[in-house]
Interface confidence: low
């Protein structure tokens, strides 16, 4: 399977909410012994590999924001902790996987990565990630609502295998 990032750049005004999205593509094993772990973190554009550095989002680590379930099941974080920080990650039946950030500030600008780990229990794992940029703007040049820029076809499948 692969992870697609429908949008590579989100430009938002301060105070707005934004939902960053990744999509799981390709065959997904729904077997009983397969679990999917999906999470989000901040990163920086590394010289060797994007998303290799893993930093918290608003002080919440990947552990705080992760979802786990089998196949394309729906899931979402109900953690009070995440919601107190204005964050919620969610996943639907169609492979869409998102994080919503509320009341954006300039400090939220940066590179965001989604990570999916497929674990076949006690046997093997497969990891893929996607990256996107969030720019939060203030002042007269800021848009009134979030503007999203589609990924180029080669960017939209950001694949890293374990």
């Amino acid at each position: 399977f692969k992870v697609a990032t429908p949008y590579s750049l989100y430009v938002c005004p301060e105070g707005q909410n934004v939902t960053l999205t990744c999509r799981l593509l390709g065959p997904v094993d729904k077997g009983h012994d397969v679990t999917f772990y999906k999470t989000w973190y901040r990163s920086s554009r590394g010289e060797v590999q994007t998303c290799s550095e893993r930093r918290p989002i608003r002080n919440l680590t990947f552990q705080d924001l992760h979802l786990h379930h089998g196949g394309h099941q729906a899931a979402n974080t109900s953690h009070d902790l995440a919601q107190r920080h204005g964050l919620e990650s969610a996943s639907d039946h169609h492979g869409n996987f998102s994080i919503t950030m509320r009341n954006l500030t300039l400090l939220d600008s940066g590179l965001y990565c989604c990570l999916v780990v497929e674990i076949r229990h006690h046997h093997s794992e497969h990891r893929v990630h996607g990256a996107m940029e969030l720019q939060v703007q203030t002042g007269k040049d800021a848009p009134s609502n979030c503007v999203v820029y589609p990924s180029s076809s080669q960017d939209s499948e950001n694949i890293t295998a374990a």
Epitope: F62, Q63, H68, S78, H122, H123, R127
Partner: antibody, heavy 120, light 107 residues
Amino acid sequence: QVQLVQSGAEVKKPGSSVKVSCKASGGTFSSYAISWVRQAPGQGLEWMGGIIPIFGTANYAQKFQGRVTITADESTSTAYMELSSLRSEDTAVYYCARSSYGWSYEFDYWGQGTLVTVSS
Amino acid sequence: DIQMTQSPSSLSASVGDRVTITCRASQSINTDLNWYQQKPGKAPKLLIYAASSLQSGVPSRFSGSGSGTDFTLTISSLQPEDFATYYCQQNRGSPITFGQGTKVEIK
């Protein structure tokens, strides 16, 4: 079958450090949280912190922050717990424990325990 | 931190008895609660995860229930090998915390 094998018993002086290892075999290592749980003589269980090797960053209980370092070596499927500035109340059996489902923290596999005795 | 309080701290029972141990969380943890059994000199053993799911290989006489703040571990018919200490543990939030334990002794 997953097995966690810990290093042997240690006797340490107050103020020194101890490093305990936990080698995993028989399953995927990287994506499962490995925690360290200690048990003082006649006492209950106390979680010290955990690490998910795929990420490399550890999560520590506030009580041990600054004194404990948990690391993992994916190449050898080994997790380590180092506790510094030891005092007599750190005398305990230290267990490594692995989560059942990846990044959650319920523990279905445990090491045999490592007794650390702190005595002058 | 989320505090976990078990009761009773110890109990005496006979083989065949029905035994109930309770665990209370200081705040809601949904069903993020696990139960362990520990025998002297041994590592703990996972019995129940997610409040009510029986871990593979654990006898069906063990059961768990509850959600939010109040949880129960029940042994429907106590067997000789069940004399041990039982711990609850929450994995809702960091740090992970355990109850203080309940020792089940032979009457």
